[in-house]
Interface confidence: low
């Protein structure tokens, strides 16, 4: 009798996740009598994929009717392929018996699954940083196959170069993950800036996936402080102004101190945004000069976003009154922790 051949014509098949895969198998002879079974993998740990006689294989259907007389086509179709289905599939002929005896195996067809990467997820630093500091953003995407993938970082459309990227695992796997870290140097103008992680993969047909992060969630822009005195009014009241400018985020508390004693505390809220995303705030204090014998030391103390307070002080010269003082006199910068931390 002619020697039985089990023919698996394709050495490999590549399928997109979610599609169906057809694994072809024909036999050269109807003799000897016995079933065909499909396995994934070889050796004792192989996994039964399809057995016409028994079992429930909801995703596997025969391509032609295997119950037909003289059928020699034992090709199967596996629906809704996932990366977990990747592997080498063997069509195996058994000789009928008790039990059936394995007679011959096909050469095997390697099924590789093209799986899209998941949407890139970008995460930023846990705490805010100020301008000139470097912060790290991480981008992750999972579940793609094959392993070849390209990841790029952009800040406001410009590609970033300080990037470290890893694809895992290093060896063969049904699917892969990519993790990339980009280091970004912040500037005061970055409140409206955005970083984008762009992932390109063969399954995306030229339309890369993007994940974004707003630098507004990673940056702190400390305020500039300026204290000025306006002209004295006819009622012996001096209007002293504290201008707090160019800060972000909006969380800010301002305290006025007269000769070291708290006079008033205010919280910033519902401020209009500058074009660059920062905020300005002006607070003023009316000082009744006639109520004081000595010069009055006024301090504008600002706590921004939970950071240590920054002070600006100004002395109102009582001796110079009741005549008018020169208007818009800039304040001296005195006291502790009063460096302009920009």
């Amino acid at each position: 009798e002619e020697e039985l051949q089990v023919i698996q014509p394709e050495k490999s098949v590549s399928v997109a996740a979610g599609d169906s895969a057809t694994l072809n198998c024909t036999v050269s002879s109807l003799i000897p009598v016995g079933p065909i079974q499909w396995f994934r993998g070889a050796g004792p740990g192989r996994e039964l994929i399809y057995n016409l006689k028994e079992g429930h294989f909801p995703r596997v259907t025969p391509v032609s009717d295997p119950t037909k007389r003289n059928n020699m086509d034992f090709s199967i179709r596996i629906s809704n392929i996932t990366p977990a289905d990747a592997g080498t599939y063997y069509c195996v002929k058994f000789r009928k018996g008790s039990p059936d005896v394995e007679l011959k195996s096909g050469a095997g067809t390697e099924l590789s699954v093209r799986a899209k990467p998941s949407a890139p997820v970008v995460s930023g630093p846990a705490v805010r940083a100020t301008a000139e500091h470097t912060v790290s953003f991480t981008c992750e995407s999972h579940g793609f196959s094959p392993r070849d993938i390209t990841l790029k970082w952009f800040k406001n459309g410009n590609e970033l170069s300080d990037v470290q990227t890893n694809v895992d695992p290093a060896g063969k796997s049904v699917s892969y993950s990519i993790r990339s870290t980009a280091r970004v140097v912040l500037t005061r103008r970055d409140v409206h800036s955005q970083v984008i992680c762009e992932v390109a993969h063969v399954t995306l047909q030229g339309d890369p996936l993007r994940g974004t992060a707003n630098l507004s969630e990673a940056i702190r822009v400390p305020p500039f402080l300026e204290v000025t005195q306006q002209s004295m009014r006819a009622d012996n009241q001096v209007n002293v102004t504290c201008q707090v400018t160019k800060f972000y985020p909006q969380r800010l508390q301002l305290t006025w101190l007269e000769n070291g004693n708290v006079s008033r505390t205010e919280m910033a809220s519902a401020l209009p945004e500058n074009k660059d995303g920062t905020y300005n705030w002006t607070s003023w204090l009316l000082v009744n000069v006639s109520a004081h014998r000595d010069d009055v030391k006024l301090t504008c103390q600002v706590e921004h976003d939970g950071q240590p307070a920054v002070n600006k002080s100004f002395s109102v010269k009582v001796s110079a009154h009741p005549k008018e003082q020169g208007s818009n006199t800039a304040a001296e910068n005195t006291g502790t922790n009063e460096r302009n931390i920009y």
Partner: antibody, heavy 123, light 107 residues
Framework: QIQLVQSGSELKKPGASVKVSCRAR????????MNWVRQAPGQGLEWMGF????????TYAQGFKGRFVFSLDTSVSTAYLQIGSLKAEDTAVYYC????????????????WGQGTLVTVSS | DIQMTQSPSSLSASVGDRVTITCRAS??????LAWYQQKPGKSPKALIF???YRYIGVPSRFSGSGSGTDFTLTISNLQPEDFATYYC?????????FGQGTKLEIK
């Protein structure tokens, strides 16, 4: 600033229908899938399904097929949940929640949530 | 469906304490797990995604760990604003499912 802004509370009679809206602000609606989550009074969170905002294709969880319809109006950046033939057991807060990408069909973490819409069904 | 079981259902702690909430999945969900915080009358807030990564703006006292079926959310140095209900959620397989919640109360 990214926000999902939902319509206000509704009081309905059994058998009536209700339509809850969820407006996306600060990002492009069609870039992210929109999920719907139910929270009955004093209970936990229950995922109802999502709508692929790019194709408009809805996916419903098992208990939410039939009377529940997800839809979109991309011209006003809004997703909708419509519930028909209301029952007392539909009384709950309904949340819309954004998933990080419509191309990730195995769902994802919900990074932004609407403020919730209380639907009360009572005769 | 994948069942997500949180423990404990509730716990009492004091400001400054370190607390751990666990979440167990009935099947392997890889690292497709998120944690949310919900305060009474408010919508849930995303804390952690992919089992371990904090969203931007989430304080570093919140940390996640685990993979497969066993996950934990740890809050170190509890603050007054941390008293809330916490939910885990798997997003590995449809339907997406949440844990029943853990109510963290002030002692």
């Amino acid at each position: 600033q990214i926000q999902l802004v939902q319509s206000g509370s509704e009081l309905k009679k059994p058998g009536a229908s209700v339509k809850v809206s969820c407006r996306a602000r600060g990002y492009t609606l069609t870039d992210y899938a929109m999920n719907w989550v139910r929270q009955a009074p004093g209970q936990g969170l229950e995922w109802m399904g999502f709508i692929n905002t790019y194709t408009g294709e809805p996916t419903y969880a098992q208990g939410f097929k039939g009377r529940f319809v997800f839809s979109l109006d991309t011209s006003v950046s809004t997703a909708y949940l419509q519930i028909g033939s209301l029952k007392a057991e539909d009384t709950a807060v309904y949340y819309c929640a954004r998933t990080r990408g419509y191309y990730d069909f195995d769902g994802g973490a919900f990074d932004y949530w609407g403020q919730g819409t209380l639907v009360t069904v009572s005769s | 469906d994948i069942q997500m079981t949180q423990s404990p259902s509730s716990l009492s702690a004091s400001v400054g304490d370190r607390v751990t909430i666990t979440c167990r999945a009935s099947q392997n969900v890889g690292t497709h797990l998120a944690w949310y915080q919900q305060k009474p009358g408010k919508s849930p807030k995303a804390l952690i995604f992919s089992a371990i990564y904090r969203y931007i703006g989430v304080p570093s006292r919140f940390s996640g760990s685990g993979s497969g079926t066993d996950f934990t959310l740890t809050i170190s140095n509890l603050q007054p604003e941390d008293f809330a209900t916490y939910y885990c959620q798997q997003y590995n397989t449809y339907p997406l499912t949440f844990g029943q919640g853990t109510k963290l109360e002030i002692k």
